[in-house]
Interface confidence: medium
Amino acid sequence: GVFNYETETTSVIPAARLFKAFILDGDNLFPKVAPQAISSVENIEGNGGPGTIKKISFPEGLPFKYVKDRVDEVDHTNFKYNYAVIEGGPIGDTLEKISNEIKIVATPDGGSILKISNKYHTKGDHEVKAEQVKASKEMGETLLRAVESYLLAHSDAYNEQKLISEEDLGGEQKLISEEDLHHHHHH
């Protein structure tokens, strides 16, 4: 069967910056900002796009040693990320995979809402353990808050990039960070 769990959470961080840090660079950030939750992330195959397989290892003392995630979709425009847990962790005799969708939506106050959908694909008529859903939710919350704290403490990290016109750059068009933009306009 398929059991769907949906939740929402808020962040004070703007959507574009959060997507860049939490989703696109989570592999590097998570072990750095939340070593108590994730010890390492390694790419088994792929370059981060759809089809990429990642192995996420957990520190000793947590219930599972590792999980393998498969990236299914990365939508940079709509800040959407789909992936599936396909091996390790709770995957086994009763659970085939967990399909996850994270969408980060900008809010008028400059923060964001994360809309999260977790679909548990069980084998036969097995049900999902409530504690598994709770543990997964808590892990997500731990990672999000750790990334959020990092971003609050490092205001220059993962800033949105702006496309500067050829005119502004004297015929050269390129992606430029806000920090570079500040520098460019003052020199």
Epitope: T7, T9, V12, G111, K137, S149
Partner: antibody
Framework: QVQLVQSGAEVKKPGASVKVSCKAS????????MHWVRQAPGQGLEWMGW????????NYGQKFQGRVTMTRDTSITTAYMELSRLRSDDTAVYYC?????????????WGQGTLVTVSS | DIQMTQSPSSLSASVGDRVTISCRAS??????LNWYQQKPGKAPKLLIY???NLQSGAPSRFSGSGSGTDFTLTISSLEPEDFATYYC?????????FGQGTKVEIK
Amino acid sequence: QVQLVQSGAEVKKPGASVKVSCKASGYTFAAHYMHWVRQAPGQGLEWMGWINTYTGGTNYGQKFQGRVTMTRDTSITTAYMELSRLRSDDTAVYYCARDRRNWNFVFEYWGQGTLVTVSS
Amino acid sequence: DIQMTQSPSSLSASVGDRVTISCRASQNIKNYLNWYQQKPGKAPKLLIYEASNLQSGAPSRFSGSGSGTDFTLTISSLEPEDFATYYCQQSFSIPWTFGQGTKVEIK
């Protein structure tokens, strides 16, 4: 430990404005939304709005739009709520409240309250 | 706006009694329901969040249940310090709204 300390009681005339402050300590100020909730004498609780303390963006309850302004000063970890064009029915205790930062807007920590009396 | 209706509006009970307070939402709010305790002249205190989760520091005699539109706060065995007013609050959609309160008085 987390503390929210509000400014003292105010007495205002109808038509005037009042600005209430809420000094936060014991946590990362910018990581949490700050909400304002009021309670008229002998009445229930009424949510007025929030401020995103990181971006400064606000979300006001429709009832208060156009009359309320929420601001913050991150350098002194203080949030402010200003209510203009006061009427007698704005007489209430005004609370600031910090959210819990879980998957839900929950008012986990509250200031001690500021009594605002509107009287001619 | 979502209306929150509590019942009863007040009740009298004795120390040691089991007390239940109901809260009904005007539409489905899933489990986005929180309970607060307020004593006279004091700020409210969070007791239960997300319908059934006990806030850290809140006594274990308090419990919450329900989902959708109907919710219950239960005090398993009333203590003298539990005489107060209790409010439910929905955080499913803006504006966040509270119930009108239930005052628990000494019999």
